[in-house]
Interface confidence: medium
């Protein structure tokens, strides 16, 4: 059975994953961000459910895009450091997800723009912490 | 006295394009972002995107991806938004208005053209 | 993308009366980065309040804003007959820029 101190440091590792994920996208999802246009025209893989840790499998699938797509935002109004920040999301999603089990991610039909993916992981966590909580 | 002057009505067959200039003065052109926001007759206001005069960088409205080109000609002091293959439902008034630019990043529109009618029909 | 509610979507007043308009959004608003406008039939809109409480340059002291988060008012203290009009409210902190579904008020 997990114990508080587990679920706190799974809480605080949702939470960074959280600011992580908000940071990202308020860096994007900015009007005069001139690189947005081009950005939404990338599309990302949704999973067909998520509402547990193991779903973050879906996640660390598309972290690769993801840095490949804030790499374009680069540009002097956009500090966001894309290696780093995905190595980062990725070190909390292991810690998240665990290693124990093997989850093959299932995918939703319809694919979604970096906002919308974005979105969902966003919505995921609080979802997830709010359970915590 | 600033100012955006847009050009007159225009109508439209379904499938064409149609172009709407609007013209600045008072004001250093490329100091200030421009948004185009539409009104289709009796409803509310649609945003469409934002050029920047200064560099030319537009973002669209995910809506009008692919169909909205916004342009700016610095020496008249001219922005562009062109609109493809029309359809009856972009029958509207389209607005040009300035982002003011007095309370940081973002800023609300202080400064409106007057509306240029685009009518679609066949 | 952030959803605007405007309530009522009529409001009949007397000049003189008090004017209390809504402008809910369906997430919060960053920053209060919420303007309202004022539009005629046959003009353009017109800049009242930016930041949620802010008066445009040359806006009457009668019109006020306020709120943060989800939750925004604009207030027209004693209406003059010239405040009949659609009132809309955006925000303008992210993309999509969106604007509420107005508001009119019209003359008792």
């Known amino acids: 059975a997990p114990t508080s101190s587990s679920t706190k440091k799974t809480q605080l590792q949702l939470e960074h994953l959280l600011l992580d994920l908000q940071m990202i996208l308020n860096g994007i999802n900015n009007y005069k961000n001139p690189k947005l246009t081009r950005m939404l025209t990338f599309k990302f893989y949704m999973p067909k459910k998520a509402t547990e840790l193991k779903h973050l499998q879906c996640l660390e699938e598309e972290l690769k895009p993801l840095e490949e797509v804030l790499n374009l935002a680069q540009s002097k109004n956009f500090h966001l450091r894309p290696r780093d920040l995905i190595s980062n999301i990725n070190v909390i999603v292991l810690e998240l997800k665990g290693s124990e089990t093997t989850f093959m991610c299932e995918y939703a039909d319809e694919t979604a723009t970096i906002v919308e993916f974005l979105n969902r992981w966003i919505t995921f966590c609080q979802s997830i912490i709010s359970t915590l909580t | 006295e600033v100012q955006l002057l847009e050009s007159g009505a225009e109508v439209k067959k379904p499938g064409a394009s149609v172009k709407v200039s609007c013209k600045a003065s008072?004001?250093?052109?490329?100091?200030?972002?421009m948004h185009w926001v539409r009104q289709a007759p009796g409803q509310g206001l649609e945003w469409m995107g934002i050029?920047?005069?200064?560099?030319?960088?537009?973002s669209y409205a995910q809506k009008f991806q692919g169909r909205v080109t916004m342009t700016r000609d610095t020496s008249t002091s001219t922005v562009y938004m062109e609109l493809s293959s029309l359809r009856s439902e972009d029958t509207a008034v389209y607005y040009c208005?300035?982002?003011?630019?007095?309370?940081?990043?973002?800023?609300?529109?202080?400064?409106w053209g007057q509306g240029t009618m685009v009518t679609v029909s066949s | 993308e952030i959803v605007l509610t405007q309530s009522p979507g009529t409001l009949s007043l007397s000049p003189g009366e008090r004017a209390t308009l809504s402008c809910r959004a369906s997430?919060?608003?960053?920053?209060?980065?919420l303007a309202w406008y004022q539009q005629k039939p046959g003009q353009a809109p017109r800049l009242l309040i930016y930041?949620?409480?802010n008066r445009a340059t040359g806006i009457p002291d009668r019109f006020s804003g306020s709120g943060s988060g989800a939750d925004f008012t604009l207030t027209i203290s004693r209406l003059e007959p010239e405040d009949f009009a659609v009132y809309y409210c955006?925000?303008?902190?992210?993309?999509?820029?969106?604007f509420g579904g107005g508001t009119k008020v019209e003359i008792k």
């Open positions: 208005a300035r982002e003011g630019n007095s309370s940081g990043y973002y800023n609300a529109f202080d400064i």
């Open positions: 008072g004001y250093t052109f490329t100091s200030y972002y």
């Open positions: 050029i920047n005069p200064s560099g030319g960088s537009t």
């Open positions: 997430q919060s608003v960053s920053s209060s980065y």
């Open positions: 930041g949620a409480s």
């Open positions: 955006q925000q303008y902190g992210s993309s999509p820029l969106t």
